[in-house]
């Protein structure tokens, strides 16, 4: 047979679906690998073929589209399960071909079991919402295309295992869930169960979103350096260990890159001949504000080291800050770096 453009196993698309629920899986070729869509390909005489490899097997086999009640079917570029079974787990391949052209890609599909409280091995999307903001809405995700717009499904929302009824600041509104003046106590897993009829059968879709309440943009600040500061003097004798913590508070800023670094006499520690160790630790508040600590240590400090200028620097998307440490030699009245 002719050569086939094999895109291999697309592990970027680790598709997880719940057992005993409908699943519609689009062939990734048209979304990520090819420049044209299914309709264009189909009208050009190309055929889409599906096959799969069962979990823990090497043998590729065709998908059985003749199961009772059309449990597995294909519609355009979508593979349908109505519903899934646990042993549908495996690697699925969609291949687009005619007599002169061939392109294919495989992707893993995992059918996941859940318990009555929606606990499972499923990875949930995380929705970050700002604390104290007026209203936040989350929408039941990934339910498009399962039923026509003429069908009005029933939707039930849960927080953890508890149906959301008379929650004071959380209001279910069909496919949406509204949060009014959210607080950290609103953190958690929120699950929508969508029930819709199709051909005389009722199907359920279960979708969970992890809500994380984070600091508000109105509270966002440039970095605040707690240490070093002007009140603490690091007074050492030669031969002693010098330990200076650089402790910086970063308010939560969505997608901000928070940086902390030391300079010694204006140079990065790597560019200085001093034997310096730097250890970093990070802690987070309940609203994902970050406290980043970089501890600079010199095991056996020299008189020359005690004359150097140690400056802690910090940066986020709101600005920069820097603070020099007050270092002096014991018995030496000079707190400023000495110039000989």
């Amino acid at each position: 047979s002719e050569r086939c453009d094999d895109w291999g196993l697309d592990t970027m698309r680790q598709i997880q679906v719940f057992e005993d629920e409908p699943a519609r899986i689009k062939c990734p070729l048209f979304e990520h690998f090819l420049k044209y869509n299914y309709s264009t390909a189909h009208s050009s005489g190309l055929t889409l073929i599906w096959y799969w490899t069962r979990q823990d097997r090497d043998l590729e086999e065709p998908i059985n589209f003749r199961l009772p009640e059309n449990r597995i079917s294909k519609e355009k570029d979508v593979l349908w399960f109505r519903p899934t079974l646990l042993n549908d787990t495996g690697n699925y391949t969609c291949m687009l071909r005619n007599t002169t052209y061939c392109s294919k890609v495989a992707f893993p599909l995992e059918v996941v079991q859940k318990d009555s409280c929606f606990n499972s091995a499923m990875r949930f999307p995380v929705h970050k919402m700002y604390i104290e903001h007026g209203i936040h809405k989350i929408t039941c995700p990934n339910v498009d295309g399962y039923f026509p717009s003429s069908v009005k499904p029933s939707v039930t929302w849960y927080k953890g295992c508890t149906e959301i009824v008379d929650f004071h600041n959380v209001l279910p509104e069909g496919m949406n869930l509204s949060f009014f003046i959210p607080l950290v106590s609103n953190n958690g897993n929120y699950t929508c169960v969508v029930t819709y009829p199709e051909n005389g059968r009722l199907f359920h879709l279960t979708r969970t979103v992890t809500v994380k309440v984070v600091g508000s943009p109105k509270d966002a600040l440039p970095p605040q350096i707690y240490s070093p500061n002007d009140r603490v003097v690091y007074e050492k004798e030669p031969g002693e260990e010098l330990v200076i913590p650089c402790k910086v508070y970063f308010s939560f800023i969505m997608d901000s890159h928070n940086e902390v670094w030391w300079t010694i006499d204006g140079k990065k520690p790597d560019d200085v001949t001093v034997d310096i160790t730097i250890n970093e630790s990070v802690s987070y508040s309940s609203t994902e504000d970050e406290t980043r600590t970089q501890i600079l240590s010199i095991k056996k400090v020299t008189p020359e080291d005690l004359r150097r200028n140690y400056v802690c620097h910090a940066r986020n998307t709101k600005g920069e800050a820097e603070q020099a440490a007050k270092v002096k030699q014991k018995g030496n009245g000079c707190t400023e770096p000495m110039t000989l």
Partner: antibody
């Protein structure tokens, strides 16, 4: 200096309406959530309503839901409480207070007395 | 809603003595608990937030402790101006709720 000054209280008949105002100064009003707390004569404190700093989110105690409406005008640094269908049990001193999620109600007004009686 | 229960209802203490006020939540409120002081004819004043952090300008004789469901306000040495009603309040969940108050009176 943070100051909150309520006004609009008074005597009103059952079923009547009243609009309370709270003028804020000494802080950036538009960055704080605001709330109303009431205290019936000789009783304890009861949270009534809250509004987000941007005015979009509002919450109410079950005892006033559907009858009271909280609002704010950030351009005027003023908080409001529209009280309709008033009942005798709404008789109380009404305080406005500012809040943050980490300090709760950190500053309070001096209160305004609402008396519902025929 | 979370019910806050304060005890005792009234506490009789001599000036200079220590006063210990308790507050219990019907479910965990983490450390999201505040204490307020109210004197007759005045608005409440924030004393403690975050269960243990003193608000601006509050004397060191006031201290708060606890987390979850059990909280304590301690006044180490009562001054004449400390005789008042004290309220605890949870702000972990909406609706925010207050305890019924503890009256600290002169013995």
């Amino acid at each position: 200096e943070v100051q909150l000054l309520e006004s609009g209280g008074g005597l009103v008949q059952p079923g009547g309406s009243l609009r309370l105002s709270c003028a804020a100064s000494g802080f950036i009003f538009s960055t704080y959530g605001m709330g109303w707390v009431r205290q019936a004569p000789g009783k304890g404190l009861e949270w009534v309503s809250a509004i987000s700093y941007d005015g979009e989110g509002t919450l109410y105690a079950d005892s006033v839901k559907g009858r009271f409406t909280i609002s704010r005008d950030n351009s005027k640094n003023t908080l409001y409480l529209q009280m309709n269908s008033l009942r005798a049990e709404d008789t109380a001193v009404y305080y406005c207070a500012r809040f943050r999620y980490y300090t709760a109600f950190d500053y309070w007004g001096q209160g305004t007395l609402v008396t519902v009686s025929s | 809603e979370i019910v806050m229960t304060q005890s005792p209802a009234t506490l009789s203490v001599s000036p200079g003595e220590r006063a210990t006020l308790s507050c219990r939540a019907s479910q965990s409120v983490s450390s999201n608990l505040a204490w307020y002081q109210q004197k007759p004819g005045q608005a409440p004043r924030l004393l403690i937030y975050g269960a243990s952090t003193r608000a601006t300008g509050i004397p060191a004789r006031f201290s708060g402790s606890g987390s979850g469901t059990e909280f304590t306000l301690t006044i180490s040495s009562l001054q004449s101006e400390d005789f008042a009603v004290y309220y605890c309040q949870q702000y972990n969940n909406w609706p925010w709720t207050f305890g019924q108050g503890t009256k600290v009176e002169i013995k």
